[in-house]
Amino acid sequence: PEPPTACREKQYLINSQCCSLCQPGQKLVSDCTEFTETECLPCGESEFLDTWNRETHCHQHKYCDPNLGLRVQQKGTSETDTICTCEEGWHCTSEACESCVLHRSCSPGFGVKQIATGVSDTICEPCPVGFFSNVSSAFEKCHPWTSCETKDLVVQQAGTNKTDVVCGPQDRLRA
């Protein structure tokens, strides 16, 4: 629009002046005036600001507390926060990843559909007909039943979602 109907995108209004915001990684020390420019200062060590801003204090970087199973995935800068993730075998309880819990295991009769990551839990699925899982595991998928025919054997005991079939020799009398 012409003329402007507001301060420009990276400005803010104060005392009738459109002042420049501070860029990411810097905090506001003093507003601009008729005589002076906006004064900004870089954030200190372990601090950040990730947007154009008029904040007088920088935010502290997130602490990845090892007592909560957390570790640093990406170190913070003056413009970005630290990103935490969980230790091996654990995953975050929320998007913010403030604490971790142990990956769940899939019970017998269930197999792993998706292995857990640092941010998502194990996804289990029931073993369909023809497949089984006889262990509680965070990694094992459902295994297919053994094919007795390919071994020149016959099914002696039917499989379930928790057990494999039991194969046995063919009845020679029927041969």
């Epitope: 012409e2 003329p3 109907t5 301060c7 002042c19 420049s20 860029q23 420019e37």
Partner: antibody, heavy 125, light 107 residues
Amino acid sequence: QVQLVQSGAEVKKPGASVKVSCKASGYTFAGYYMYWVRQAPGQGLEWMGWINPDSGAPTYAQKFQGRVTMTRDTSISTAYMELSRLRSDDTAVYYCAREKIYYGSGNYYPSFDYWGQGTLVTVSS
Amino acid sequence: DIQLTQSPSFLSASVGDRVTITCRASQGISSYLAWYQQKPGKAPKLLIYAASTLQSGVPSRFSGSGSGTEFTLTISSLQPEDFATYYCQQLLSYPWTFGQGTKVEIK
């Protein structure tokens, strides 16, 4: 203190292009729109357009549309104005100028509070 | 485009004189007007914005007034350093045009 320092004088042949630079210091470059104005020898001031240094989006005066390109490099706080297909009547001093906006009586009033020292571009065969 | 016509184009005056320059717009521009001073070989310098607001650092002998289509720049007591060319600029409608200038010379 705010300073806009422009590149040196240029002599070009008709049909050529010229690229003038304007290096800003003393303020947050991406926070203020940058304008270009030219002045032919002994003549008045002519507005050419502006660039938003944050997004890089330019707006050109109709007269220069298709011949002018305004760009910027935020990493070195520098704005550029390139004029192509030069003619002898493009001989002028080219200025960059920073926009300031004042708010009063419910309106936002722009003006140019800081100017570069000017770059003389001479177009001659 | 909005045309700005300054009068007079040339003005001879003495130190201490009160000087008035007029700027007329071809259509109403509210208070979207600025005044600049330019000395030979130098860049323009902002004096007045929003028609009547004095830019910081500019001596108080300079003043601006007007609204709509008629504007004036007044120098209450001309000083030796005030001999220069003065331009008005409208900032309502693109292109942001300038007046043709008023040259203030020593009488």
